[in-house]
C-alpha cells in the first residue's frame, strides 16, 4: 500500500542541523549560510504502529538514499544507527519495528521516540559535532526536542 | 493567533480555469500541512487534498489530474488550481491546517470562499 | 478509498438531552477518527480527534470513543448552542481521508 512521506530537515531545540559523519553516521552542529545546505534531508513517513493519544508512528529515511533511521542493541544498550535497505521494498506501511519511532507534537517541538525502545528518544549532545545517539533520559543535559522544517524541491 | 483567509472563489463557465489562495498568519506553511476541503451547497465536506513540502502532495482519487495544490512558504500563501471547472464543482472551498505531521484532523480552518461554475 | 457512514442523517432533540450519533469506517481505521461541528454559514470546528481526545476549548458534554471501524460522538446534554450538523473523518496519515455524510442535530 502507498505510504504518505514528506521531506524535511531537522534541528534541535539548540538550532544544530543533522549532518552526515561517515557513510553510516549523523552528527549535530551549528551551520550557516551556505553551509545549511550539507544537512541531512529526511523522508519521513507515516507507518502503522501502536496507538496513543499523543505519539503517531513515522520511519525516518535520508532523502533519495536507501537509508533509515533504526534502533538495535549493542553491546546490551539500545543504540541508533542508519540501515541499509532494499529500495525496492521501502517506505513500506509496515516497517521493522526497529524503523519506527513514536513522533511526539508539542508547542510545534517535535520528540522522536523508538518504538523497539520505549523511553529512548533520538538525542543530541549540547557540544558541537558530536553524533546523533539514542538517548535514556529526557529533560537533562542532552537534548531530544527537535523543530521540523519542509524542504522544497 | 491562527489566521487562514482564503480568496480567489467567483463565477467561471464550464471548461474553465480558477485559481484560489489561501494567506495564512500565526504560523508559518514551513512546518504545517495544509488540505484543502470543499462543500457543494446543501451538502456535507469533501477533502480535495493536502499539501507538505512542495514535492509532496497527496489527492482525493477524484481530484487527481483536475486539481493542483501548491504553496508559496514566503508569502504565507497557499493555492489551488482548478481545470476543467463542471458544474458539479460549485461549492464553498475550505482551506485548512493539519494539527499535527500526519494527525490528519484539522484544527484551523477559513471562512470559505465560493466557486459557482456555470454558464 | 475508505467511506465513513454516519447514522443517523438528521437527529431531533431537545434542550438537556443525552444525544449520539455514529460513524462507521469501511475498514480499520484505528484510532485515527476525529470529529466536527459546523454551524451554517461557518467553517467546521475540530472537536475531537484521535477518537476520544477533546480538541482544545471543546466542552467536556462532548465525548468520543471508539475504535477499528465504529466510533460514537455522545453530547451528554444538549445545550442550544449545539445544534449544528456534525461530520465524522478518517484522519492519520493515510493517503485519503474521508468525511461522513453528516448528522444534523436539530431542534424537536
Known amino acids: 500500500a502507498p505510504v504518505r512521506s514528506l521531506n524535511c530537515t531537522l534541528r534541535d531545540s539548540q538550532q544544530k542541523s543533522l549532518v552526515m559523519s561517515g557513510p553510516y553516521e549523523l552528527k549535530a552542529l551549528h551551520l550557516q549560510g551556505q553551509d545549511m545546505e550539507q544537512q541531512v534531508v529526511f523522508s519521513m513517513s507515516f507507518v502503522q504502529g501502536e496507538e496513543s493519544n499523543d505519539k503517531i508512528p513515522v520511519a525516518l529515511g535520508l532523502k533519495e538514499k536507501n537509508l533509515y533511521l533504526s534502533c538495535v542493541l549493542k553491546d546490551d544498550k539500545p543504540t541508533l544507527q542508519l540501515e541499509s535497505v532494499d529500495p525496492k521494498n521501502y517506505p513500506k506501511k509496515k516497517m521493522e519495528k526497529r524503523f519506527v519511532f513514536n513522533k511526539i507534537e508539542i508547542n510545534n517541538k517535535l520528540e522522536f521516540e523508538s518504538a523497539q525502545f520505549p523511553n529512548w528518544y533520538i538525542s543530541t549532545s549540547q557540544a558541537e559535532n558530536m553524533p546523533v545517539f539514542l538517548g535514556g533520559t529526557k529533560g537533562g543535559q542532552d537534548i531530544t526536542d527537535f523543530t521540523m522544517q519542509f524542504v522544497s524541491s | 493567533e491562527v489566521q487562514l483567509v482564503e480568496s480567489g472563489g467567483g463565477l467561471v463557465q464550464p471548461g474553465g480555469s480558477l485559481r484560489l489562495s489561501c494567506t495564512v498568519s500565526?504560523?508559518?506553511?514551513?512546518?504545517?500541512?495544509m488540505s484543502w476541503v470543499r462543500q457543494a451547497p446543501g451538502k456535507g465536506l469533501e477533502w480535495i487534498g493536502i499539501?507538505?513540502?512542495?514535492?509532496?502532495?497527496y489527492y482525493a482519487s477524484w481530484a487527481k489530474g483536475r486539481f493542483t495544490i501548491s504553496k508559496d512558504t514566503s508569502k504565507n500563501t497557499l493555492y489551488l488550481q482548478m481545470n476543467s471547472l463542471r458544474a458539479e464543482d460549485t461549492a464553498v472551498y475550505f482551506c485548512?491546517?493539519?494539527?499535527?505531521?500526519?494527525?490528519?484532523?484539522?484544527?484551523?480552518w477559513g471562512q470559505g470562499t465560493t466557486v459557482t461554475v456555470s454558464s | 478509498d475508505i467511506v465513513m457512514t454516519q447514522s443517523p442523517s438528521t437527529l431531533s432533540a431537545s434542550v438537556g438531552d443525552r444525544v449520539t450519533i455514529t460513524c462507521q469506517a469501511s475498514?480499520?481505521?484505528?484510532?485515527?477518527l476525529s470529529w466536527y461541528q459546523q454551524k451554517p454559514g461557518k467553517a467546521p470546528k475540530l472537536l475531537i480527534y484521535?477518537?476520544?481526545t477533546l480538541a482544545s476549548g471543546v466542552p467536556s458534554r462532548f465525548s468520543g470513543s471508539g475504535s477499528g471501524t465504529d466510533f460514537t460522538l455522545t453530547i451528554s446534554s444538549l445545550q442550544p448552542e449545539d445544534f449544528a450538523t456534525y461530520y465524522c473523518?478518517?484522519?492519520?496519515?493515510?493517503?485519503?481521508?474521508?468525511f461522513g455524510q453528516g448528522t444534523k442535530v436539530e431542534i424537536k
Open positions: 485548512a491546517r493539519e494539527r499535527q505531521i500526519f494527525s490528519g484532523d484539522m484544527d484551523g
Open positions: 500565526g504560523f508559518s506553511l514551513s512546518s504545517y500541512a
Open positions: 499539501i507538505y513540502d512542495s514535492a509532496s502532495t
Open positions: 475498514q480499520s481505521i484505528s484510532s485515527y
Open positions: 484521535k477518537a476520544s
Open positions: 473523518q478518517n484522519a492519520g496519515g493515510g493517503i485519503n481521508i474521508a
